[in-house]
Each structure stands twice: as structure tokens, then as C-alpha cells.
């Protein structure tokens, strides 16, 4: 029997093909076989089908990187990594996506889901759209909605200072952050660490964080597959 999606455009389509184990998969932007991209799929969280695009877990990867690195992506998809703004922009241009953020620390966990998530193109400096919060972590991303991405060598924030430089990370900074998931791992100094303000504040660096996305209509697609 042929696959439902011979060239899956995201992890949800890979899952609908019958792949239910979390791990590395190849997806194809716009279903185009010439635009292959290796991604890590989370097939378990809240029904699965998520493309993980950020993971922090041990501090082994350096996240204090320049614009070029954040545009392209870096790290090991099985460990700590950033998928890349160019990839995020292309993926979210395929349709309507939702964002999920999973946070864990010393046995505690929290999550945030945003119904509508997109990253603009390079021309917009990868402008963030994030709306429709639900979850237990608190709505910290709302503050960053509408912001362009900033790195230490490309300052697009609204602060007097360079936020990426001040807080040794990169993000859709405003003035400066409520979320700093690309901050310095394990650094509990004010605003310097891996922060999600409305969960653990700015003086605590969270041990584990993942950001992931899947189509907003995934549940409908999943239900259709089960009925079929």
C-alpha cells in the first residue's frame, strides 16, 4: 500500500504515514522532493506530530551565536540544537501552524501552546507571530509577538542596549525578554539563563526546554485517519 504522504511536509504527515516513534525523519518543504530537511519529530507529546526546532538539556551546545548561525541552524538534532530561522520560515509558510513549548525542571513540568505560530521571511528579519495561548507555563511568548529576531551581530530589538549582547543569547527580543530559551544554560543571574518568566522568573535557568510546531488542524487530520 502506498504512503498517504510520499513526501511529508512536516512531522504530522510523517505520523499520518504510520510513523509513531519519536526520532529523526526527513520532511520535504511544500512536499517538494528537492527540498529535503532532516528534523526531529516528537510523536508522543499531546498526540504527537511535532517538529522540534529547539532543545536545551545539558549546556553542551553554544547558543551565543551570530545571525548567520541562527538563520541556518546548528547542533545535533538528537541533543541540543536550533533548527534554523530559514527552515522555520519555510515550514510555517506551508500553512497554519501551532507552537508547543515543553519545560522541565527537577521533576516539575509545564507547557505552553499557541494556536497560531509563524516566522516571517529573511526580509522581515524572521518576524514572529504567536497568538492563542493555553497551558500551564504562563503566557510569556505574548510579549515577543510581532518582534523580529535579534542576535548579537544584528540588533533588531527596541531596547537602548543590544538585548542579545546583554543576555548572551538570541531571540525575538523586544526590551528585552520574557522568554530567553537560547540564554546561557545553568546561569541563574538575572535574565541571563534559560528563562520562561511566567513559570520560573528571570533568576532561574530551566533545565530542559523544547519548542516544537505542527499544523493547527492536526487533530482533524488525525481523526480523519483513524476513521479511515
Amino acid at each position: 500500500i502506498g504512503l498517504l504522504y510520499p513526501f511529508p511536509r512536516d512531522c504530522s504527515q510523517a505520523m499520518l504515514n504510520g510513523d509513531t516513534t519519536s526520532g529523526l525523519y526527513t520532511i520535504y518543504i511544500n512536499g517538494d522532493k528537492t527540498q529535503a530537511l532532516e528534523v526531529y519529530c516528537d510523536m508522543t507529546s499531546d498526540g504527537g506530530g511535532w517538529i522540534v526546532f529547539l532543545r536545551r538539556k545539558n549546556g553542551r551546545e553554544d547558543f551565543y551565536r551570530n545571525w548567520k548561525a541562527y538563520a541556518a541552524g546548528f547542533g545535533d538534532r538528537r541533543e541540543e540544537f536550533w533548527l534554523g530561522l530559514d527552515n522555520l520560515s519555510k515550514i510555517t509558510a506551508q500553512g497554519q501552524y501551532e507552537l508547543r513549548v515543553d519545560l522541565q525542571d527537577h521533576g516539575e513540568s509545564a507547557y505552553a501552546v499557541y494556536d497560531r505560530f509563524s516566522v516571517g521571511d529573511a526580509k522581515s528579519r524572521y518576524k514572529l507571530k504567536v497568538e492563542g495561548y493555553s497551558g500551564t507555563a504562563g503566557d510569556s511568548m505574548n510579549y515577543h509577538n510581532g518582534r523580529s529576531f535579534s542576535t548579537y551581530d544584528k540588533d533588531t530589538d527596541s531596547a537602548i542596549t543590544n538585548c542579545a549582547l546583554s543576555y548572551k543569547g538570541a531571540f525575538w527580543y523586544k526590551n528585552c525578554h520574557r522568554v530567553n530559551l537560547m540564554g546561557r544554560y545553568g546561569d541563574n543571574n538575572h535574565s541571563q539563563g534559560v528563562n520562561w518568566f511566567h513559570w520560573k522568573g528571570h533568576e532561574y535557568s530551566i533545565q530542559f526546554a523544547e519548542m516544537k510546531l505542527r499544523p493547527s488542524n492536526f487533530r482533524n487530520l488525525e481523526g480523519r485517519r483513524k476513521r479511515a
Epitope: 503566557d139 505574548n142 510579549y143 509577538n145 537602548i160 526590551n175 528585552c176 535574565s191
Partner: antibody, heavy 120, light 107 residues
Framework: QVQLVESGGGLVQPGRSLRLSCAAS????????MHWVRQAPGKGLEWVSG????????YYADSVKGRFTISRDNAKNSLYLQMNSLRAEDTALYYC?????????????WGQGTMVTVSS | DIQMTQSPASLPTPVGDRVTITCRAS??????LNWYQQKPGKAPKLLIY???NLETGVPSRFSGSGSGTDFTLTISSLQPEDFATYYC?????????FGQGTKVDIK
């Protein structure tokens, strides 16, 4: 243009209730968190309460917690403040205010205020 | 709660002079600091947001600076219409708190 108009203020006895309203126009109301800020006669500004765009999250100053309830009706573009167990120290001009974007943000639009006087 | 301390409380100043108002937060607030102007009988008006960003329509003689705990509002050359009370506000965390105000009046 963007506008906020408060109403519902008046003279009320201690222990009684009052409901303030704020009618919004000129912007997509449910996209923005809204707040109430008050100013006692001759005094400074005091933040009272805030509510998220969806109405799902609410916040209160300690001085009003348990007595005041903030709510909104996005279909009517309206914000409300239900004030129960009123005290003399609640006497103030009450302003509703719109945030620039997120919940904890600057207040870029303010109403003209509605006066609440609590006295026997 | 974060306490905001403004100084001075009153500032008699001649027209044309430079005005500097300071605001200090009781804890680190990054740049989550806003400035408002209020004239008698009127609602407050946003001047500066995020410590240094001029609100649309506000004259360029107003400027803001600072980060962390110490912030400044500057009026480069005081105009007659600038006589008012100025408030700082932290929007770092709930409850959002205001300074006690600085009244700028005619000297």
C-alpha cells in the same frame, strides 16, 4: 479613532457595590489586554486590575483582591469592573486603559475616567 | 511588589531649561519602564515606553534612558505646554507600579 469611555461611577455608601463599564472603539478589542487604574483625589496613579485579551487571565492589586472582579465582553467591546464591599479608600477617579501589545506593557490609550465616591 | 521611587517630587523650572527626572526601581526590571504626562483634569498620556522609545506624536524634546534599576526622563528645552505631573511605571511584573509623580511647574 481609538477611544475608551468609562461609565458607572457615582456616590455609594461603604459596603455597597458598583459596576464600572468601559466602552472601546477604533481597535480590535479582543487583541489587547485591558487594565483599570485609579487616582485618589490629589494623589498619584495606582494600578487596580488587568485582564488578558481573551479574558482567561485576570490580575488584581492586593488592595482590591477578593472585592473587585474584572471582566470583559469581547462581542460588545466592553470592559467591566465589579466593585463589592466598597471602602472609603476606594474613592478615586477610575480609568480604563489599553496596553500597547502584551499584558505587561505600557498603557497607550486611556479613557477620561469615571469618579467613584465612597461615603456615608 | 516592585517599588518605584521618583525624584524630585517637585521641579520649578523656567521655560527653555533642560529638565531631568529620575526613577529608581527597587529591583532589576530590564528596560520595562514607561513614562506618562498628566495635566490637571486630564487622563495620563504615554510619552516613553520601554525606557527609551518615543510614543507616536510625542515631541522629540522628550527622551528616556536607563536600564536595570535607574531611569531618566529628559525634556531638552521645557515648553509652556510641558508643565504637568510626570509618572514612571514599571511594566516588568504584576502588579504594575507607578512612581509617586514629579510635578514640573513654572519657576
Amino acid at each position: 479613532q481609538v477611544q475608551l469611555v468609562e461609565s458607572g461611577g457615582g456616590l455609594v455608601q461603604p459596603g455597597r457595590s458598583l459596576r464600572l463599564s468601559c466602552a472601546a472603539s477604533g481597535f480590535t478589542f479582543d487583541d489587547y489586554a485591558m487594565h483599570w487604574v485609579r487616582q485618589a483625589p490629589g494623589k498619584g496613579l495606582e494600578w487596580v486590575s488587568g485582564i488578558s485579551g481573551s479574558g482567561g487571565s485576570t490580575y488584581y492589586a492586593d488592595s482590591v483582591k477578593g472585592r473587585f472582579t474584572i471582566s470583559r465582553d469581547n462581542a460588545k467591546n466592553s470592559l467591566y469592573l465589579q466593585m463589592n464591599s466598597l471602602r472609603a479608600e476606594d474613592t478615586a477617579l477610575y480609568y480604563c486603559a489599553k496596553v500597547m501589545s502584551s499584558m505587561e506593557d505600557a498603557f497607550d490609550i486611556w479613557g477620561q475616567g469615571t469618579m467613584v465616591t465612597v461615603s456615608s | 511588589d516592585i517599588q518605584m521611587t521618583q525624584s524630585p517630587a517637585s521641579l520649578p523650572t523656567p521655560v527653555g531649561d533642560r529638565v531631568t527626572i529620575t526613577c529608581r526601581a527597587s529591583q532589576y526590571i530590564q528596560g520595562f519602564l514607561n513614562w506618562y504626562q498628566q495635566k490637571p483634569g486630564k487622563a495620563p498620556k504615554l510619552l516613553i515606553y520601554d525606557a527609551s522609545n518615543l510614543e507616536t506624536g510625542v515631541p522629540s524634546r522628550f527622551s528616556g534612558s536607563g536600564s536595570g534599576t535607574d531611569f531618566t526622563l529628559t525634556i531638552s528645552s521645557l515648553q509652556p505646554e510641558d508643565f504637568a505631573t510626570y509618572y514612571c511605571q514599571q511594566s516588568y511584573s504584576t502588579p504594575q507600579t507607578f512612581g509617586q509623580g514629579t510635578k514640573v511647574d513654572i519657576k
